[in-house]
């Protein structure tokens, strides 16, 4: 997971939309108890912004110690600062908790840049603006870290919501959400609505701003418009999905669809950008450049180095194309597409000497670890992580930033053949999967 700093090929053919629409998700089958409807107490329980992550308030220990915890669908450890650190306002003090149990085991998590290490234990955990339950969960007490905590981010730990396969030190360490589902009646599903600001926020505004919602155990209808469309979770490690086609302003990138998923495609709330494999990134940038050629942007802009600025309120959104990702559908030979606007992939930046202007960073970047659908994508949609049915749902977010001419969209079905061939099979090695 990233914290402004995770053969024989053939094409998946995108076709015209079918005449029929798939049934709306809510019309499908009998409801699971507590599975959907209104979750008022959980709405608006996230804060933060795409550049530094979204966090939820959690309590750990007895008596409860309150901490802000980064919501990360790209990792699987619940890990919290447990020692003083210059970037932490507060940290978990195990010695003050009567319910803490030491597992007498260490954990070390290296990233390409930086690392964290700590000691494993268990304690009682709850989410004040979540389900009214307390669970005993594994906790990695971070005692040492490098380039992990972010100055000014306002979070003190990380909630890895992915599967046990990528948990550290190994898959025997049960992730928080697995513990929650096992120990309570909370359905095995959560959903995220991340709300990008659309304009830069200064530090005091961030602390006061609403970042979105994490609905634990269900789906809240008020957080999306239109229908939810589901894509299968290919494998339960990261939240891995399959992209079958990519379009820029309706123009197919015409790449072998395996390239889009080389070496995987994941949905990761802990990553800021939409990250694309090198070849795909280069093709996408070429296409976005061509579509927006009425203005000449510096090379550094496409790398994320230079910002582009316009006089306040005059950003020419219309010159930038929409980007559509087609995802494998639940029905054979059927896909659907999610479409994001420049309002999602141009990220507003503060701290600039051009304060009379609106300045943006290009938030699509190159990856050597596959496609990462980070906050840039997620801020356009309400995303349902339906673990029980091994699928991820997308609907247009009620809070996404758009203009009067275009809106983010989730549309389907489309006929797409040979979609299984779009998945890349990673050679099995003992190497770490977390070095993103």
């Amino acid at each position: 997971t990233q914290h402004g700093i995770r053969l024989p090929l053939r094409s998946g053919l995108g076709g015209a939309p079918l005449g029929l629409r798939l049934p709306r998700e809510t019309d499908e089958e009998p409801e699971e108890p507590g599975r959907r409807g209104s979750f008022v107490e959980m709405v608006d329980n996230l804060r933060g912004k795409s550049g530094q992550g979204y966090y939820v308030e959690m309590t750990v220990g007895s008596p409860p110690q309150t901490l802000n915890i980064l919501v990360d669908t790209g990792s699987s450890n619940f890990a919290v600062g447990a020692a003083p650190h210059p970037f932490l306002h507060r940290y978990y003090q195990r010695q003050l908790s009567s319910t803490y149990r030491d597992l007498r085991k260490g954990v070390y998590v290296p990233y390409t840049q930086g690392k964290w290490e700590g000691e494993l234990g268990t304690d009682l955990v709850s989410i004040p603006h979540g389900p009214n339950v307390t669970v005993r969960a594994n906790i990695a007490a971070i005692t040492e870290s490098d380039k992990f905590f972010i100055n000014g981010s306002n979070w003190e730990g990380i909630l890895g919501l992915a599967y046990a396969e990528i948990a550290r030190p190994d898959d025997s360490l049960e992730p928080f959400f697995d513990s929650l589902v096992k120990q309570t009646h909370v359905p095995n599903l959560f959903s995220l609505q991340l709300c990008g600001a659309g304009f830069p926020l200064n530090q005091s505004e961030v602390l006061a701003s609403v970042g979105g919602s994490m609905i634990i155990g269900g789906i809240d209808h008020s957080l999306y418009t239109g229908s939810l469309w589901y894509t299968p979770i290919r494998r339960e490690w990261y939240y891995e999905v399959i992209i079958v086609r990519v379009e820029i302003n309706g123009q197919d990138l015409k790449m072998d669809c395996k390239e889009y998923n080389y070496d995987k495609s994941i949905v990761d709330s802990g990553t800021t950008n939409l990250r694309l494999p090198k070849k795909v990134f280069e093709a996408a940038v070429k296409s976005i450049k061509a579509a927006s050629s009425t203005e000449k942007f510096p090379d550094g802009f496409w790398l994320g180095e230079q910002l582009v600025c316009w006089q306040a309120g005059t950003t020419p959104w219309n010159i930038f194309p929409v980007i559509s990702l087609y995802l494998m559908g639940e029905v054979t030979n059927q896909s659907f597409r999610i479409t994001i606007l420049p309002q999602q992939y141009l990220r507003p930046v503060e701290d600039v000497a051009t304060s009379q202007d609106d300045c943006y960073k290009f938030a699509i970047s190159q990856s050597s670890t596959g496609t990462v659908m980070g906050a840039v994508i997620m801020e356009g949609f309400y995303v349902v992580f339906d673990r029980a049915r091994k699928r991820i749902g997308f609907a247009v977010s009620a809070c996404h930033v758009h203009d009067e001419f275009r809106t983010a969209a989730v549309e389907g079905p489309f006929v797409t053949l040979d979609m299984e061939d779009c998945g890349y099979n990673i050679p099995q090695t003992d190497e770490s999967t977390l070095m993103t």
Epitope: Q2, H3, G4, I5, G51, Q52, T112, Q113, I150, N151, G152, E295, K296, F297, P298, D299, G300, L303, G304, E305, Q306, L307, V308, C309, V349, D351, V352, A353, T354, C359, K361
Partner: antibody, heavy 116, light 107 residues
Framework: EVQLQQPGTELVRPGTSVKLSCKAS????????MHWVKQRPGQGLEWIGV????????KFNQKFRGKATLTVDTSSSTAYMQLSSLTSEDSAVYFC?????????WGQGTSVTVSS | DIVMTQSQKFMPTSVGDRVSVTCKAS??????VAWYQQKSGQSPKALIY???HRYSGVPDRFTGSGSGTDFTLTISNVQSEDLAEYFC?????????FGGGTKLEIK
Amino acid sequence: EVQLQQPGTELVRPGTSVKLSCKASGYTFTNFWMHWVKQRPGQGLEWIGVINPSDTYTKFNQKFRGKATLTVDTSSSTAYMQLSSLTSEDSAVYFCARPTVGLDYWGQGTSVTVSS
Amino acid sequence: DIVMTQSQKFMPTSVGDRVSVTCKASQNVGSNVAWYQQKSGQSPKALIYSASHRYSGVPDRFTGSGSGTDFTLTISNVQSEDLAEYFCQQYNSYPYTFGGGTKLEIK
């Protein structure tokens, strides 16, 4: 307030290396790349290269490849430039600068004198 | 590499004058040009970006214009504190390049 702090002077021997620092404050260090610029006495400005602190991706002026190495320490919000195999041609003031559009904030510069 | 040429090394001026410093790019750089002011013994200070936009806090007597290959920095009603060297820079493509500088001097 955005600030880039650089030490004032470095006196070094020919053939050795020097590591210049640039400590950033007043903004989120990983959100902005960091540039390095050379200025020889009484002369113009020469762009050396740039580093992205969030992933250490670098881009160089071909002329400085092999001469300059750019690194960062995000935990201390500090960018570094190491200059190797120093000669009198490397005697100059070296600035770090942060970009938004162009280079909006500059450090005060470190004066490097290469002398035996 | 793109060459940025400031043909006038020195520009004699008096307080109250209006002066124009010119800069020519060897190829089209769009509007991706910045202007900097540097006083003796100091670091450069950013004045103009995107050829014609003033950075925050820069007095409005400084105006930038031009696009493509020809750029101008105009200082209307020159003040004594404006006596300095001025550099143009293109950030359209790597490597970034600077003009050789134009020094404003008292006549």
